[in-house]
Amino acid sequence: LTCLGGFASPGPVPPSTALRELIEELVNITQNQKAPLCNGSMVWSINLTAGMYCAALESLINVSGCSAIEKTQRMLSGFCPHKVSAGQFSSLHVRDTKIEVAQFVKDLLLHLKKLFREGQFN
């Protein structure tokens, strides 16, 4: 988590700040959405439990050519301790359920806001 905040960061970013920034980026995506997000691409739904940052990244990394979520993908990689590449599949995915990226982002945003309110940053 200490690496979050981008290359220009003068120093380590507190976990709460990193989470707030991720939330603000997701808010940005949902508020600026005009056409269907990522052309209505579908991604695997995930269980919003421990390890969900990696699971979320594993889902979203399979969406290519969607500039709207590129920053989110980068930010999520800072929360995931291992390298994630397209095609990886986590046990946290709900295998039989695919949802639109817009719904995925909305669900993730809701959960992260509650984690922030409850002080759960890891």
Partner: antibody, heavy 120, light 112 residues
Framework: EVQLVESGGGLVQPGGSLRLSCAAS????????IHWVRQAPGKGLEWVGR????????KYDPKFQGRFTISADNAKNSAYLQMNSLRAEDTAVYYC?????????????WGQGTLVTVSS | DIQMTQSPSSLSASVGDRVTITCRSS???????????LEWYQQKPGKAPKLLIY???NRFSGVPSRFSGSGSGTDFTLTISSLQPEDFATYYC?????????FGGGTKVEIK
């Protein structure tokens, strides 16, 4: 329009049970937290506990843990307060309230309250 | 548990008066996310409470500018700059930073 409506209050004997309901409209309870707050006659406000209906994460004031149980039914968009082993000192108006939906910083909507009277 | 101590418990004032209510927490109510979830609610007899101030000093939408909040750490203040007839009510501070959340005992503002 956002609205919270409590029901289920009334007269109950000491040792008895009561289940209060909080019916929400104008928003989805899964998107926020629902809290229960009570107020004894002529006294101040007292936070009882809260539920996150999205995952049934529930927190109580320890003084109510064990006797009181908070739950939610997302299909009915309602929250509940089950009160057991009631005592005279539980006599109060019981309110439900929601956390605002942006960052959950405060209670922006409250119900009208339902009066619970514990007496023999 | 965090105790929220309000003072005074009641006060008498006239329309136009400046009124100050204080609230002291038994320990810091800065949340681990950096926010201080200190709120002020107004309640009139037979009615549900209404939010006035959140996160110490932010006025809720629709709340008149005569209401203001300040403070940090453990000491907080609600100020009514010029008391109006509709302001006669009971005021509660509330901390939503640490569970169990807690209210202050209330301050009843009465007509002198």
């Amino acid at each position: 329009e956002v609205q919270l409506v409590e029901s289920g209050g009334g007269l109950v004997q000491p040792g008895g049970s009561l289940r209060l309901s909080c019916a929400a409209s104008g928003f989805n309870i899964k998107d926020t937290y629902i809290h229960w707050v009570r107020q004894a006659p002529g006294k101040g406000l007292e936070w009882v506990g809260r539920i996150d209906p999205a995952n049934d994460n529930i927190k109580y004031d320890p003084k109510f843990q064990g006797r009181f149980t908070i739950s939610a039914d997302n299909a009915k968009n309602s929250a509940y307060l089950q009160m057991n082993s009631l005592r005279a000192e539980d006599t109060a108006v019981y309110y439900c309230a929601r956390s605002e939906e942006n960052w959950y910083d405060f209670f922006d909507y409250w119900g009208q309250g339902t009066l619970v009277t514990v007496s023999s | 548990d965090i105790q929220m101590t309000q003072s005074p418990s009641s006060l008498s004032a006239s329309v136009g008066d400046r009124v100050t209510i204080t609230c002291r927490s038994s320990q810091s109510i800065v949340h681990s996310n950096g926010n201080t979830y200190l709120e002020w609610y107004q309640q009139k007899p037979g009615k549900a409470p209404k939010l006035l101030i959140y996160k110490v000093s932010n006025r809720f939408s629709g709340v008149p500018s005569r209401f203001s909040g300040s403070g940090s750490g453990t000491d907080f203040t609600l100020t009514i700059s010029s008391l109006q007839p509709e302001d006669f009510a009971t005021y509660y501070c509330f901390q939503g930073s640490h569970i169990p959340y807690t209210f202050g005992g209330g301050t009843k503002v009465e007509i002198k």
